[in-house]
């Protein structure tokens, strides 16, 4: 069970032996920031490999990551958030590979939450609202949100709407009547900070009203 069958281990050309990627989360636990790294190659033997960050730190020169299963993690208040840090993969004292990274450019926001959809009968629309912990943060406050929705039977036909607020109105006439919809939302930094999409929020499911035959309008649920 240790390797791939057929011709031994695979060598996928685009994967460098020790290539890795990282993301930061600012004020993720009170005033503490976090940095999470992992190897891109799933076949790397990580047994004796460690990660270290040096530079652009407050009060200390370097910090070591904790290994959590197969990822590497730091939670600290000591990120300066100005300039680049050097993140290295190490075996003992020897550095195998390093990357200079500005932690403000690899920010992954926390996932939005409390997503809900309310039908307004008089307005013939659906009001989508959600919450984000970033409204309370000092640093990563400005986000772009990606709301994605689909008819539940359409496996991959997602409609995406980008918005900067946490409220969206969907017109009833743009949706199929008497159908079950799935909706979810994610966020990405949109101002000074740069980085990656958050994880998706948990999905919310809602049903559109049926069409009222006499008026051609949908019935409320």
């Amino acid at each position: 069970e240790s390797g791939y069958a057929q011709n031994g281990d695979l060598e996928d050309a685009e994967l460098d032996d020790y290539s890795f990627s990282c993301y930061s989360q600012l004020e993720v636990n009170g005033s503490q920031h976090s940095l999470t790294c992992a190897f891109e190659d799933p076949d790397v033997n990580i047994t004796n490999l460690e990660f270290e960050i040096c530079g652009a730190l407050v009060e200390v020169k370097c910090l070591n990551f904790r290994k959590l299963q197969e990822i590497y993690f730091i939670e600290t208040k000591k990120f300066l958030l100005i300039g680049k840090s050097n993140i290295c993969v190490k075996v003992g004292e020897k550095s195998l590979t390093c990357k200079k990274i500005d932690l403000t450019t690899i920010v992954k926001p926390e996932a939005p939450f409390d997503l809900s959809v309310v039908y307004r009968e008089g307005a013939n629309d659906f009001v989508v609202t959600f919450n984000t912990s970033h409204l309370q943060k000092k640093y990563v406050k400005v986000l772009m949100h990606d709301v994605a929705y689909r008819q539940e039977k359409d496996e991959n036909k997602w409609t995406h709407v980008n918005l900067s607020s946490t409220k969206l109105t969907l017109l009833q006439r743009k949706l199929q009547p008497a159908a079950m919809y799935e909706i979810k939302v994610r966020s990405i930094p949109d101002h000074y900070f740069k980085g990656f999409w958050s994880e998706w929020s948990p999905s919310y499911y809602f049903r559109t009203p049926e069409i009222n035959n006499s008026s051609g309008e949908m019935d409320p649920i």
């Epitope: 990627s21 190897f39 891109e40 190659d41 799933p42 959590l68």
Partner: nanobody, 117 residues
Framework: QVQLVESGGGLVQPGGSLRLSCAAS????????MSWYRQAPGKERELVAS????????RYADSVKGRFTISRDNAKSQLYLQMNNLKFEDTAVYYC??????????WGQGTQVTVSS
């Protein structure tokens, strides 16, 4: 305890497609390298594809390269295997599990994929 529930298998003609899913629980999915394995009748279980914790790196067995795509959704603790251009020799029970297995790691029930005309 660790639970792995595979689904999405079925009977398909050569050249057809299937998408397998695996729902994982009982461990921190986002911290683990995850893999799909398969076992054909009378053969040993073999490693088919693996994906890094963030989903940004993948590896495939030579026999499925260019046809299969492994992906993951850490928010849902779900692992996927998109299988295109299926061949007779892809017939097997497919299992998901951690890439780096420990002796104590349990297996799910698997999902049967049968390629037949």
């Amino acid at each position: 305890q660790v639970q792995l529930v595979e689904s999405g298998g079925g009977l398909v003609q050569p050249g057809g497609s299937l998408r397998l899913s695996c729902a994982a629980s009982g461990f921190t999915f986002s911290q683990r390298i995850m893999s799909w394995y398969r076992q054909a009748p009378g053969k040993e279980r073999e490693l088919v594809a693996s994906v890094s914790p963030f989903g940004d790196g993948t590896r495939y067995a030579d026999s499925v390269k260019g046809r299969f795509t492994i992906s993951r959704d850490n928010a849902k603790s779900q692992l996927y295997l998109q299988m295109n251009n299926l061949k007779f020799e892809d017939t097997a029970v497919y299992y998901c599990n951690k890439r780096n297995l420990e002796i104590s790691d349990a297996w799910g029930q698997g999902t049967q994929v049968t390629v037949s005309s």
